[in-house]
């Protein structure tokens, strides 16, 4: 009876996500067979989050709306370890929007999920950000510094990275 009700709950939870994510990849968390964590296929997973690299070129606002439709946001990078994981899936000759912007052009950077902007946990390329008109952040590769962030015009199409919390069933 317990297993049956657990299965019913899982199925109803899966139905919630089916509209946008018809296929999930799930792994057992720890040793308890009851707990599974899932990411949409073909998203990648790191710690408690799922990541999707969008190769379509879109403006920052459109990229964020695109992530939102999938139940995600443009990526918020909280640690060096998280960035190191993300860059494994990026192409060196491309730039990708982050969920970081400065719409007022006053260098008040803000993350899309309202995570406080912490100057101590940022990975700007040297000399960046450098232009008050460039109000959205990308991550890109520079041969001298490897991967880092740069400010860029929000209306110019780029690739992007979406991030969502893992789905627990």
């Amino acid at each position: 009876n317990f297993m049956y009700s657990k299965t019913v709950k899982r199925l109803s939870k899966l139905r919630e996500y089916q509209q946008y994510h018809p296929s999930l990849t799930c792994v057992m968390e720890g040793k308890d067979i009851e707990d599974w964590s899932c990411c949409p296929t073909p998203w990648t997973s790191f710690q408690s989050s799922c990541y999707f690299i969008s190769t379509g070129m879109q403006s920052w606002t459109k990229s964020q709306k695109n992530c939102s439709v999938m139940g995600a946001d443009l990526v918020v990078i909280n640690t060096r370890e998280e960035q190191d994981f993300i860059i494994q899936n990026l192409k060196r000759n491309s730039s990708y929007f982050l969920g970081l912007s400065d719409p007022g052009g006053r260098r008040h950077w803000q993350w899309v999920d309202q995570t406080p902007y912490n100057e101590n946990v940022t990975f700007w390329h040297s000399g960046e950000p450098n232009n008050l008109d460039e109000r959205c952040a990308i991550i890109n590769f520079r041969s001298s510094e490897e991967w880092g962030w740069n400010d860029i015009h929000c209306h110019v199409p780029q690739k992007s990275i979406c991030k969502m919390k893992k789905i627990y069933i």
Epitope: Q58, S59, D133, C136, I152, H155, V156, P157
Partner: antibody, heavy 121, light 111 residues
Framework: EVQLVESGGGLVKPGGSLRLSCAAS????????MSWVRQAPGKRLEWVAT????????YYPDSVKGRFTISRDNAKNSLYLQMNSLRAEDTAVYYC??????????????WGQGTTVTVSS | DIVLTQSPASLAVSPGQRATITCRAS??????????MHWYQQKPGQPPKLLIY???NLESGVPARFSGSGSETDFTLTINPVEAEDTANYYC?????????FGGGTKVEIK
């Protein structure tokens, strides 16, 4: 007073080249993104090229990409548009316009009087 | 590209009356309460002149009889009351993404 004055327009044969100039005054030219916008006779306005304030980025629509090059000389307060491989459909009045950024986009807050480019054999 | 469709293509208004021009975008030009639609006036033989930015903000020096409203895909420019000097073409423009695009224009004539 902000002023933008275009020059360099004229009659050119298909396949030919022209270089347009825009002399800016009355503001700190190096602090603003600048664009060229054109208007063919009786048609809507069409964006042609943008250059960022720091000269780090240039943008073009597909219709002119590879044929037109926007550049600027901040020391001379001047904006340029090099137009190569001109076609009949490039015939228009070409305006130089200053960009003012607002939130995630921008608008054109000052425009020059325009210079006419006619491409005809 | 985002397509902007203006209507009507032309209208004739008596002085003192209200003129209303609409601009419809093929997709939303709004994000988190910011509407990246702008309006310009162009008189014959002259360059465009900025009237309204970000849907409803009146550019400095523009008479208060001009106003703008709207969000997402539908925007309106209103001139109330119309004066003889308002004879011109009016254009909307979006800047939420490249390429920036303009509407086809609305010709306003004063009766």
């Amino acid at each position: 007073e902000v002023q933008l004055v275009e020059s360099g327009g004229g009659l050119v044969k298909p396949g030919g080249s022209l270089r347009l100039s825009c002399a800016a005054s009355g503001f700190t030219f190096s602090s603003y993104g600048m664009s060229w916008v054109r208007q063919a006779p009786g048609k809507r306005l069409e964006w042609v090229a943008t250059i960022s304030s720091g000269d780090s980025y240039t943008y073009y629509p597909d219709s002119v990409k590879g044929r037109f090059t926007i550049s600027r000389d901040n020391a001379k307060n001047s904006l340029y548009l090099q137009m190569n491989s001109l076609r009949a459909e490039d015939t228009a009045v070409y305006y130089c316009a200053r960009q003012l950024y607002y939130s995630y986009g921008y608008y054109f807050d000052y425009w020059g009087q325009g210079t006419t480019v006619t491409v005809s054999s | 590209d985002i397509v902007l469709t203006q209507s009507p293509a032309s209208l004739a208004v008596s002085p003192g009356q209200r003129a209303t021009i609409t601009c419809r975008a093929s997709e939303s030009v709004s994000f988190h309460g910011t509407h990246l639609m702008h309006w310009y006036q162009q008189k014959p033989g002259q360059p465009p002149k900025l009237l309204i930015y970000a849907a409803s903000n009146l550019e400095s020096g523009v008479p208060a009889r001009f106003s703008g409203s709207g969000s997402e895909t539908d925007f309106t420019l209103t001139i109330n009351p119309v004066e003889a000097e308002d004879t011109a073409n009016y254009y909307c423009q979006q800047s939420i993404e490249d390429p920036p695009t303009f509407g086809g224009g609305t010709k306003v004539e004063i009766k």
